[in-house]
């Protein structure tokens, strides 16, 4: 039961995380105009990975896409790549994890196959989360560097009568969404990997120890009785263990799955 809960929770957390990564990638507010000493501005600039926008105090908002590919900074391209890789890996991970869920029965899929799929999806979620965190962090670092550079330039070159106010950019909402989403995906992936350990059938476990069939908390325990000597394949006992666990899980876990989805 604990394994199913861990796996289900890992799936849901990863799902929320990947939705967040997608949202962050699509958001326009990766960097927003720094308002420093002027909280009310007539023209407010903000930028995303795909377009830059201007919101006027009139309420008019105009967004322009970055139609060039070669003319964009290498760092921006790198962040785009990291976020897309994160989304793709996360999406594949979600697809794999759906079939790996213990509460979903697909044909006569063995527990070992489900365990492998759970581990695969878990690793995918971890890498996806790391990609998102890396992408957002690279962008944040780029912003910090540019912020201090523009601050240094702000008060130079003003020898004449004409002043040019340079627009400084600070962290936008998308960065925080990305960090949180990446973290959630990472946590979800770790939970899936933990669940995988409990799902993996122990070849030598519980053989000729039929009383373990009803004790699910013991039966699910990873790494138990590894040193015990086997008596050959006991299909009868295995059936009791598998069947008992599945029936109980289906009754208890299925409604909660529907609640989440």
């Amino acid at each position: 039961m604990a394994v199913t809960a861990c796996q289900g929770l890992g799936f849901v957390v990863s799902l929320i995380g990947i939705a967040g990564i997608i949202a962050a990638t699509c958001m326009d507010q990766w960097s927003t105009q720094d308002l420093y000493n002027n909280p009310v501005t007539a023209v407010f600039n903000y930028q995303g990975l795909w377009r830059s926008c201007v919101r006027e105090s009139s309420g008019f908002t105009e967004c322009r896409g970055y139609f060039t590919l070669l003319g964009l900074p290498a760092m921006l391209q790198a962040v785009r790549a990291l976020m897309i890789v994160g989304i793709v890996l996360g999406a594949i991970g979600l697809l794999v994890s759906i079939f790996a869920l213990k509460c979903i029965r697909i044909g006569s899929m063995e527990d070992s196959a489900k365990a492998n799929m759970t581990l695969t999806s878990g690793i995918m979620f971890i890498v996806s989360g790391l990609c998102a965190i890396a992408g957002v962090s690279v962008f944040a670092n780029m912003l910090v560097t540019n912020f201090w550079m523009s601050t240094a330039n702000m008060y130079t070159g003003m020898g004449g009568m004409v002043q040019t106010v340079q627009t400084r950019y600070t962290f936008g909402a998308a960065l925080f969404v990305g960090w949180v989403a990446g973290g959630l995906t990472l946590i979800g992936g770790v939970m899936m990997c933990i669940a995988c350990r409990g799902l993996a059938p122990e070849e030598t476990n519980y053989k000729a120890v039929s009383y373990h069939a009803s004790g699910h908390s013991v039966a699910y325990k990873p790494g138990g009785f590894k040193a015990s000597t086997g008596f050959g394949s006991n299909t009868k006992n295995k059936k009791i263990y598998d069947g008992g666990a599945r029936t109980e899980d289906e009754v208890q876990s299925y409604p909660s799955k529907h609640d989440y989805v």
Epitope: A42, V43, N45, S52, E56, S58, E62, V162, T167
Partner: antibody, heavy 115, light 113 residues
């Protein structure tokens, strides 16, 4: 079609108060008050976001003038306190449009500050 | 605050003349985000409310005759009336629309010669 009609102007003594109103019809996201002293140029007074209530003022009017709106009546206000002779002017309400330009203006209301 | 300086303060011209009014700002009105200059031009006739002519330095408001045109970037801007008509005799104002507080030029009065 946007229509703006100001009211509330008149003669007031120095140090006195006055509240100007601007009846608004049509879409207005943000509104402004602009004034024009007799024979002088235009002077921007204040801006308000009609949805959020966010506002800002020209330095000369901070603390003395208050811009506000009443959603239910669809009306813009300018509360003017501690009035001085130099506040004598025609006060216009105007809608902010693309490019932060003032596209629709009221007919104006004259405020005279004199003893 | 951004200061706006218009020149000339007044000019005399005849119907059909080409008229140019300049406006200079103390800071750049060019926004890097959309590469647009936040300068607006208005026309005002005696006893009337101002009328919007041009926004974003060069975008003509719908309904405004095409003889009016705006140009410029950064700190220097120009309003041009290609062929002055009798109804164009008025006072023209430029406005900083880039940052609060919005500021106006002192105005240019176009009179009949």
């Amino acid at each position: 079609e946007v229509q703006l009609v100001e009211s509330g102007g008149g003669l007031v003594q120095p140090g006195g108060s006055l509240r100007l109103s601007c009846a608004v019809s049509g879409y207005t996201f943000s509104m402004n008050w602009v004034r024009q002293a007799p024979g002088k140029g235009l002077e921007w007074v204040a801006w308000i976001n009609m949805y959020t209530g966010e506002r800002t003022y020209a330095d000369d009017f901070k603390g003395r003038f208050t811009i506000s709106r009443d959603d239910s009546k669809n009306t813009l206000y300018l509360q003017m306190n501690s009035l001085r002779a130099e506040d004598t002017a025609v006060y216009y309400c105007a809608r902010l449009y693309n490019g932060n330009s003032l596209d629709y203006w009221g007919q104006g209301t004259l405020v005279t500050v004199s003893s | 605050d951004i200061q706006m300086t218009q020149s000339p303060s007044s000019l005399s011209a005849s119907v059909g003349d080409r008229v140019t009014i300049t406006c200079k700002s103390s800071q750049s009105l060019l926004n890097s985000g959309n590469i647009k200059s936040y300068l607006t031009w208005y026309q005002q006739k005696p006893g009337k409310a101002p009328k919007l002519l041009i926004y974003w330095a060069s975008t003509l408001r719908s309904g405004v005759p095409s003889r009016f045109s705006g140009s410029g970037s950064g700190t220097d801007y120009t309003l041009t009336i290609s062929s002055l008509q009798p109804e164009d005799f008025a006072t023209y104002y430029c406005q900083n629309a880039y940052s609060f507080p919005f500021t106006f030029g002192q105005g240019t009065k176009v009179e009949i010669k």
